[in-house]
């Protein structure tokens, strides 16, 4: 019997200061570039080494970005989302959704010597 995979979803406000080379991450998604099935949201696909996001440490690959400086990222074309980040100014506030995978053991077996439970 296989364990069930659950997700713990949390939201966080991350304030980044644009560095010499920018914010330091890549994104995927948008209404014209669905990265996740049935979800046109904007996701972090890469954190650049030594960039502003990496040095801050809170933004993670796979995070969904819900808003930039209070502006909702729902139903945006991919390039419009990219442009929104590029024009976001020096101090950038990101509302992000972290999705942490939680591995549960088989029902009725957790807590019985299984360290993954």
């Amino acid at each position: 019997m296989n364990g069930r995979v659950d997700y713990l979803v949390t939201e966080e406000e991350i304030n980044l200061t644009r560095g010499p080379s920018g914010l330091g991450f890549n994104i995927v998604g948008g209404t014209d570039q669905q990265y996740v099935s049935n979800d046109s949201g904007i996701y972090v696909s890469r954190i650049k080494e030594n960039g502003a996001a990496a040095l801050d440490g809170r933004l993670q690959e796979g995070d969904k970005i819900l808003s930039v400086n209070g502006q909702d990222l729902k139903n945006l074309l991919h390039q419009d989302a990219v442009d929104l980040f590029r024009n976001a100014g020096y101090a950038v506030s990101l509302r992000v959704q972290h999705r942490l995978q939680v591995q549960n053991g088989p029902i009725g077996h957790r807590g019985e010597g299984d360290p993954s439970g």
Partner: nanobody, 127 residues
């Protein structure tokens, strides 16, 4: 992981043409920015051309502008480099590279450090 396989290299006379292809694995090819780089013996790897996820934006090194054309076919998971008016100084190993997603900072994708995956390369020799 993404796998990139280049083909189309070879030996050609100066003034001739070649078309390089780079086939990529993975269902999310249409989200990658793609680039071509080259490395001549004893020299550093240098940027040649790049194309964004949709094919709507391209960028070229000054040395190849007007001679090389980068394009992509997302239905075929393939990016191309059409090389015309080849010169002996174009002789190098040509590498295809993929960057996952669009940089929120850079428009040109000319920095090798922006790329996540690299092919093994294909040799182009111009005599």
């Amino acid at each position: 992981d993404v796998q990139l396989v280049e083909s189309g290299g070879g030996l050609v006379q100066a003034g001739g043409s070649l078309r390089l292809s780079c086939a990529a694995s993975g269902r999310t090819f249409s989200t990658y920015a793609m680039g071509w780089f080259r490395q001549a013996p004893g020299k550093e790897r240098e940027f040649v051309a790049a194309i964004n996820w949709s094919g709507g934006s391209t960028n070229y090194a000054d040395s190849v502008k007007g001679r090389f054309t980068i394009s992509r076919d997302n239905a075929k998971n393939t990016v191309y480099l059409q090389m015309n008016s080849l010169k002996p100084e174009d002789t190098a190993v040509y590498y295809c590279a993929a960057a996952i997603g669009s940089s929120v900072d850079s428009y040109d994708h000319s920095d090798p450090l922006e790329y996540d995956y690299w092919g093994q390369g294909t040799q182009v020799t111009v005599s």
